[in-house]
């Protein structure tokens, strides 16, 4: 992209409540892909907070693309009553926190975490690697942030935001230091390379989120995770564009978004990413 394509969006306050995304891909911009078909599809627009129509070229693109308006709404919007703050002093847990742990049918035996509604705590379990349900977290911290109550009985979201008991407002807690880069791509791009269970030595690429580059690794031929691409180009296309450079908290964000400048605040963003 040329420098003219880059947009420097100033993040400023508006009347919009904080945006809560059910899936990280809902934040992706509409991507028509390189092909030339004319297919009516829908995407979630984080600026208008609505599902909107766009023309898809028929190949590639990204996950923010749905066959119908209903599917888009189901995946990316929440009922306003549940959106951010309950009238009580406690935010509502996502429904999937109340599902039982589910190992799925595969045989990967991966350590994951689930919220146990009996003990009200996040606990470890063995996940097979496929199917299962959304009460399935890669880290204990992620599980706690999304499903456990905070120390005062308040629901804490996965950006360390807690409902303030004094004025019912959302206040950022210092549980996470904002980093220079924030990732808004598929969650599997943040997982480590996983050789898998078999004995082959296939050349694959994985996205190294620490250095922000796609690197080769040897894949065993089965198992593993989705941070696994047959080419460097495919890896970059899937993962590289997920990064947004953050200059300062509430400051400048440099994006490569070809759209007119809009002033919007995406405050204390909650992204419930569950890639199964």
């Amino acid at each position: 992209d040329s420098e003219e394509d880059e947009e420097h969006t100033i993040i400023t306050d508006t009347e919009l409540p904080p945006l809560k995304l059910m899936h990280s891909f809902c934040a992706f911009k509409a991507d028509d892909g390189p092909c030339k078909a004319i297919m009516k599809r829908f995407f979630f627009n984080i600026f208008t907070r609505q599902c909107e129509e766009f023309i898809y070229g028929g190949c590639e693109g990204n996950q923010n693309r749905f066959e119908s308006l209903e599917e888009c709404k189901k995946m990316c919007t929440r009922d306003n009553a549940n959106r951010i703050i309950k009238t009580t002093l406690q935010q509502e847990k996502p429904d999937f926190c109340f599902l039982e742990e589910d190992p799925g049918i595969c045989r990967g035996y991966i350590t994951r975490y689930f919220y146990n509604n009996q003990t009200k705590q996040c606990e470890r379990f063995k996940y097979g690697g496929c199917l299962g349900n959304m009460n399935n977290f890669e880290t204990l911290e992620e599980c706690k942030n999304i499903c456990e109550d905070g120390p005062n009985g308040f629901q804490v979201d996965n950006y360390g935001t807690q409902l303030n008991a004094v004025n019912n407002s959302l206040t950022p807690q210092s549980t996470k230091v904002p980093s220079l880069f924030e990732f808004h791509g598929p969650s599997w791009c943040l997982t480590p390379a996983d050789r898998g269970l078999c004995r082959a030595n296939e050349n694959r690429f994985y996205y190294n989120s620490v250095i922000g580059k796609c690197r080769p690794f040897k894949y065993s031929g089965c198992g593993g995770n989705e941070n696994n691409f047959t080419s460097k180009q495919e890896c970059l296309r899937a993962c590289k564009k997920g990064f947004i450079q953050r200059i300062s908290k509430g400051g400048l964000i440099k994006t490569k978004r070809k759209r007119k400048k809009q002033r919007v605040k995406i405050a204390y963003e909650e992204i419930f990413v569950k890639n199964m």
């Epitope: 595969c106 097979g128 199917l131 598929p186 078999c198 089965c222």
Partner: antibody, heavy 124, light 108 residues
Framework: QVQLQQSGPGLVKPSQTLSLTCAIS??????????WGWIRQSPGRGLEWLGM?????????SYAVSVKSRITINPDTSKNQFSLQLNSVTPEDTAVYYC??????????????WGQGTLVTVSS | DIVLTQSPATLSLSPGERATLSCRAS???????LAWYQQKPGQAPRLLIY???TRATGVPARFNGSGSGTDFTLTISSLEPEDFAVYYC?????????FGQGTKVEIK
């Protein structure tokens, strides 16, 4: 050789319950490496996965959202079979119903054994 | 739900020709969780390929699966008379399990 034999009525009245059974031979419904499920096929809908059960030190089930409020899949370990119950049926539930085993092999999962299929018509 | 789109809807070929069937997923499903099935009229589907590229027991070597992420291909290197049927792809990555709408391979 694993085989699945389906049984159950081919005609169900609207608002009633569709009940089918799938008898397993050559494997166990309590197998630790398989899942047992139901799929239906109709001209309008194509192949539609309805749900499955599997045993991994305890029983688990997963159902399709489209039928979640109406469906029950149960194992019967004494007879080595599993059943499908679909409540409050309508003519839209008319389809060929298949039971199938999903095996998780080391290359990945797949439905490797299927029942013969039962055409269920919902009509008064 | 993960939507699987198969193309073309119909493929008209002669015995001995090569068939290339495509399956595109609406989300990344990795490389281990895609299966291909063959179905003939009046019969249940038959598993051909699992894990995107592994042939099921008894499936002839002319059937080959490839792909990962969102784009998958089933290739029949040289069509035999018994290969004319409908082919479905299926993802077993996440609930609900979903199928493509099918590609019919018919005799030209």
């Amino acid at each position: 050789q694993v085989q699945l034999q389906q049984s159950g009525p081919g005609l169900v009245k609207p608002s009633q319950t569709l009940s089918l059974t799938c008898a397993i031979s050559g494997d166990s419904v309590s197998s630790n490496s398989a899942a047992w499920g139901w799929i239906r096929q109709s001209p309008g809908r194509g192949l539609e996965w309805l749900g499955m059960i599997y045993y991994r030190s305890k029983w688990y089930n997963s159902y399709a959202v489209s039928v979640k409020s109406r469906i029950t899949i149960n194992p019967d370990t004494s007879k080595n079979q599993f059943s499908l119950q679909l409540n409050s049926v309508t003519p839209e539930d008319t389809a060929v119903y298949y039971c199938a085993r999903t095996m998780s092999k080391y290359g990945g999962p797949g439905m490797d054994v299927w029942g013969q299929g039962t055409l269920v018509t919902v009509s008064s | 739900d993960i939507v699987l789109t198969q193309s073309p809807a119909t493929l008209s070929l002669s015995p001995g020709e090569r068939a290339t069937l495509s399956c595109r997923a609406s989300q990344n499903i990795g490389s281990n969780y895609l299966a291909w099935y063959q179905q003939k009229p009046g019969q249940a589907p038959r598993l051909l390929i699992y894990g995107a590229s592994t042939r099921a027991t008894g499936v002839p070597a002319r059937f080959n699966g490839s792909g990962s992420g969102t784009d998958f291909t089933l290739t029949i290197s040289s069509l035999e008379p018994e290969d004319f049927a409908v082919y479905y792809c299926q993802q077993l990555n996440s609930i609900p399990v979903t199928f493509g709408q099918g590609t019919k391979v018919e005799i030209k």
